[in-house]
Amino acid sequence: TIPPHVQKSVNNDMIVTDNNGAVKFPQLCKFCDVRFSTCDNQKSCMSNCSITSICEKPQEVCVAVWRKNDENITLETVCHDPKLPYHDFILEDAASPKCIMKEKKKPGETFFMCSCSSDECNDNIIFSEEYNTSNPDLLLVIFQ
C-alpha cells in the first residue's frame, strides 16, 4: 500500500494501485520507436532494439507494431496505455505475457500489432499461429 509519508496527489496517474491498494510498478519495455527491420516470413523475431525504458505511467504496457509495404519493413516498439487506442486499434491483448502479433486491416500495407505486460516482452514478437488462441487445435488442447 502507499505509505502515509508518500503524498497521493489528486488526479495523479503516476500512482496506480491494484485491488489490494498496492502501488503498481511501471513496465519495462523495449522503446526504439520506428526502426527499419529485416524481420520477414519468420515465426518470431527479436526486436534488435537496445533501449529498455521505464514506461512513464504504471498502467502502460509494451507494444510492437510490424509494418510492410512496397518499400520497406519497419518495427515499432513503445510503451502505451491500453485504455487508449494505438494506430486506431484497441490493445485487446494487453494482459498477455507474450507479444503475439495479430494482423490489422490497413490499406496499402501489411500491418501487425501486439501488446503484452511482462518485462521487455516486446523484444520477442511472435507471428506463429501455434501461439494464437484463435487456433482451433490449441483451443482443443486448452479445454481438454
Epitope: 502501488v23 510498478f25 513496465q27
Partner: nanobody
Framework: EVQLLESGGGLVQPGGSLRLSCAAS???????RMWWVRQAPGKGLEWVS?????????YYADSVKGRFTISRDNSKNTLYLQMNSLRAEDTAVYYC?????????????WGQGTLVTVSS
C-alpha cells in the same frame, strides 16, 4: 524487520552533483530489483531508475538518462544514485523501494525518503 534508510540529500546548485545512498536490512537484498522513485512538491511519483538484483542491468526514466547512475553494493546491502548535472526540476523527495517478488504489484517496502533541493 525490513528497513530502507535513504541519505545523501541536501541543497545543491544547478549543475551540481549529489550521491544518494539507501541502506537496506531485514531481507535478502541481493535477490530483489531495487528502485529510486521521486516525488516533487505537489506532484505525483516519478519512477527514476531501477537496477536488477545482481546489478548487471539498469533502467532510467528519460528525464534522467545520461545524468543519473544507479548502482548497488550487495556486500554492503546498499543502493546508490549518483546524480550529476542537477536541474531545478530534480528537486524532490527521493525514495528507495524494493520490488516484491510477485512482480508489478506493490511496493512492499519504502524508505522514508531524502530531500534533494536544487536551487541557486
Amino acid at each position: 524487520e525490513v528497513q530502507l534508510l535513504e541519505s545523501g540529500g541536501g541543497l545543491v546548485q544547478p549543475g551540481g552533483s549529489l550521491r544518494l545512498s539507501c541502506a537496506a536490512s531485514g531481507f535478502t537484498f541481493d535477490q530483489d530489483r531495487m528502485w529510486w522513485v521521486r516525488q516533487a512538491p505537489g506532484k505525483g511519483l516519478e519512477w527514476v531508475s531501477a537496477i536488477e538484483s545482481g546489478g548487471h542491468r539498469t533502467y532510467y526514466a528519460d528525464s534522467v538518462k545520461g545524468r543519473f547512475t544507479i548502482s548497488r553494493d550487495n556486500s554492503k546491502n546498499t543502493l546508490y544514485l549518483q546524480m550529476n548535472s542537477l536541474r531545478a526540476e530534480d528537486t524532490a523527495v527521493y525514495y528507495c523501494a524494493k520490488q516484491n517478488e510477485s512482480g508489478r504489484s506493490g511496493f512492499d517496502y519504502w524508505g522514508q525518503g531524502t530531500l534533494v533541493t536544487v536551487s541557486s
